[in-house]
């Protein structure tokens, strides 16, 4: 069964078919409300006054999946768990389709650093998706930043149109990802 | 929803071999790491190692190096462990699981119990 | 290898108890560290992952934390159903190894 989500509140301003976010920079654990609040600007369809979609408001949606890209700063496992208040996790990249949608999204911002939900316990280990599931690098190489003041960063993120990995202490930007079912 | 049914009991004679199997189902099989874990009669769990069922790739833990080849049939969905050179502290229960967020063991069979005695 | 010790090693306790175990590696391990259910002649149940992320579809009276060294499992108000035997697992380094276990079982 599939979600439909309906809003005509006056949170956001719809403008040229845009939320338009109130882009406040939350550095403490943000409440679900200024979560939803902390994302950039996302494509919305109107329909007689009321928006009707499978994704929340201020998510965008891309295929099977809605995306939110929290724009307040948090480290790897707090970025997790703001997803996780959200219903949803951190990106996992499935597809060339999909990675292609993200680098779009993304490059918009090219200032700005957005974690997914890939990780590692240590250099030794491989790369898993959140949910559990292997890392393919037939789908993407991960850049490392390894270096030896920082000898292990065992957390990924996407800058632009590349992924690397950090420190996964590092204050960033997030894209969380929740996937529906028709 | 996630299944995984693994083989009946087995009785072995030191010096023989065992192969148990794994059959997947309720996901993509290709997608996670399947693990081995052993408990001896009475004991804790013991880690074996993992097959990636995707690349076929493997990594045994230092103990069983040597011993243990862990494998898997894409096409049926089942993965194998197979450990040699049995001896009787080998008598346990091998339990297939299907790796889970952060390195945990999400899903498992049922266990199979393999005796090895003379 | 990472040694992983638990305490107590058993407990007897009551229904609506609060029961706390604690494990502890012998090494820094983040928070790659699992908690595992596990009843006579059955496969473990997985609890928590991640230190202290609850797996769907277990009860919120089971709560897990720590970080590095330390980790502690917490069953809020003890259940019929929640004697057992309990197993915490690190994941932060090959191979990969489970603690000797706690049994809970009744006072």
């Known amino acids: 069964t599939m979600a439909i989500w309906r809003s005509n509140s006056g949170s956001n301003t719809l403008e040229n078919g845009y939320f338009l976010s109130r882009n406040k920079e939350n550095h403490s654990q943000p409440t679900q409300s200024s979560l939803e609040d902390s994302v950039t600007p996302t494509k919305a369809v109107k329909t007689t006054g009321v928006l009707s979609s499978p994704c929340p408001p201020n998510w965008i949606i891309y295929e099977k999946s809605c995306y939110l890209f929290s724009m307040s700063l948090n480290s790897w496992d707090g970025s997790k768990r703001q997803c996780w208040q959200l219903g949803s996790n951190l990106l996992k990249i499935d597809s060339s389709n999909e990675l292609g949608f993200i680098v779009k999204q993304v490059s918009s911002q090219p200032d700005n650093s957005f974690w997914i939900g890939l990780s590692r316990p240590q250099t030794e280990v491989p790369w898993l998706w959140e949910d559990g599931s292997t890392f393919s690098s037939n789908l993407f190489q991960i850049r490392t930043t390894a270096t030896q003041e920082n000898p292990s960063p065992n957390c990924v993120w996407i800058h632009v149109s590349v992924i690397y990995d950090q420190l996964c202490s590092v204050p960033s930007y997030s894209i969380c990802e929740k996937k529906f079912s028709m | 929803q996630v299944q995984l049914v693994q083989s009946g009991a087995e009785v072995k004679k030191p010096g023989a071999s065992v192969k148990v199997s794994c059959k997947a189902s309720?996901?993509?099989?290709?997608?996670?790491?399947m693990h081995w874990v052993r408990q001896a009669p009475g004991q804790g769990l013991e880690w074996m190692g993992w097959i990636n069922p995707n690349s076929g790739g493997t990594n045994y833990a230092q103990k069983f190096q040597g011993r243990v080849t862990m494998t898997r049939d894409t096409s049926i969905s089942t993965a194998y462990m197979e450990l040699s050179r049995l001896r009787s502290d080998d008598t346990a229960v091998y339990y297939c699981?299907?790796?889970?967020?952060?390195?945990?063991?999400?899903?498992w069979g049922q266990g199979t119990l393999v005796t090895v005695s003379s | 290898d990472i040694q992983m010790t638990q305490s107590p090693s058993s407990v007897s306790a009551s229904v609506g108890d609060r029961v706390t175990i604690t494990c502890r590696a012998s090494q820094g391990i983040s928070s790659w560290l699992a908690w595992y259910q596990q009843k006579p002649g059955k496969a473990p149940k997985l609890l928590i992952f991640g230190a202290s992320s609850l797996q769907s579809g277990v009860p919120s009276r089971f709560s897990g934390s720590g970080s590095g060294t330390d980790f502690t499992l917490t069953v809020s108000s003890l259940q019929p159903e929640d004697f057992a035997t309990y197993y915490c697992q690190q994941a932060y380094s090959f191979p990969f190894t489970f603690g000797p276990g706690t049994k809970v079982d009744i006072e």
């Open positions: 309720g996901y993509t099989f290709t997608d996670y790491y």
């Open positions: 699981a299907r790796n889970s967020g952060s390195y945990s063991f999400g899903y």
